[in-house]
Amino acid sequence: MMTGTIETTGNISAEKGGSIILQCHLSSTTAQVTQVNWEQQDQLLAICNADLGWHISPSFKDRVAPGPGLGLTLQSLTVNDTGEYFCIYHTYPDGTYTGRIFLEVLESSVAEHGARFQIP
């Protein structure tokens, strides 16, 4: 039975040209995390594999930085980065958990972050 839950940064916003940390946290389970995939729609951003480490998609290699932890830092933001992001936790023996983050990239200088995992 899958007992775990994923906490995410929820809905967040950031300024164009800036950077943002996408962060998820899996709790309430003792399952082993074997891999975390970060995706935007069906597009791969990056993978953090427990044995092999990080792999960044070619499309994002110049502006995605691994971490902190299992999170992902997205840099040089453009308005085209607005949209849904998913952290997909592959675990054993539970299976797959998915968290969702909505990022809005703003033109203005006022960009407020979501309530959880606030980025200074």
Epitope: T34, I47, N49, D51, L52, H55, P58, K61
Partner: antibody
């Protein structure tokens, strides 16, 4: 030494499905992506997509999404590509190749190719 | 998708010649380019990765260069075993795309 041994040529009818195999030897199967590439005469090389055998994570060229399916069997170090709803446009040579996990974006070893002919 | 163009589809040269094969991208790809060799029997080998890095085991007569949208592969001293078709491959953005190939023949 590293080898990617592909299954033999196939003659299929339009509308059918085909499954091509790629057996890897001489390296740690889970540490590399398996890439699939199509070659039609006069059309050069076309990337179909990739699978990470350790986790089964797969990513597809939009053009092949929904018709190509990648799987991998870690026990036999074999990757598979299934192509469904075949048409004459699918007549081609299909290659598997490997790409190291991590930020190594080149296909350093290739299979010998599998010729698929679709004809009624 | 980024389009890769190899304007010369076939090229004829003599043994010992210096041969240059060109490839252009529809947009800047920041040196994210590889070169492959496909022999007449269909065998494919990696020659050059990241524009100019020679893959292990590849003879030093092969070299790569370029930047922005324009790239080239040079064979400094053509040998009989170099008879093949050569493909460029960009990995700046998915989907990966390849050039149409340049077939190299001996005069």
């Amino acid at each position: 030494q590293v080898q990617l041994q592909q299954s033999g040529g196939e003659l299929m009818k339009p509308g059918a499905s085909v499954k091509i195999s790629c057996k890897a030897t001489g390296y740690t199967f889970s540490n590399y992506w398996i890439e699939w590439v199509k070659q039609r005469p006069g059309h050069g090389l076309e990337w179909i997509g990739e699978i990470l055998p350790g986790s089964g994570s797969s990513y597809y060229n939009e053009k092949f999404k929904g018709r190509a399916t990648f799987t991998a069997d870690k026990s036999s170090n074999t990757a598979y590509m299934q192509l469904s709803s075949l048409t004459s446009e699918d007549s081609a040579v299909y290659y598997c190749a490997r790409q190291k996990y991590g930020n190594f974006y080149y296909f350093d070893f290739w299979g010998q190719g599998t010729t698929l002919t679709v004809s009624s | 998708a980024i389009q890769m163009t190899q304007t010369t589809s076939s090229l004829s040269a003599s043994l010992g010649d210096r041969v240059t094969i060109s490839c252009s991208a529809s947009q800047g790809i920041g040196n994210y380019l590889n070169w492959y060799q496909q022999k007449p029997d269909g065998t494919v080998k990696l020659l050059i990765y990241y524009t100019s890095s020679l893959h292990s085991g590849v003879p030093s007569r092969f070299s790569g260069s370029g930047s922005g949208t324009d790239y080239s592969l040079t064979i400094s001293d053509l040998e009989p075993e170099d008879i093949a078709t050569y493909y460029c491959h960009q990995y700046s953005k998915l989907p990966y795309t390849f050039g149409g190939g340049t077939k190299l023949e001996i005069k």
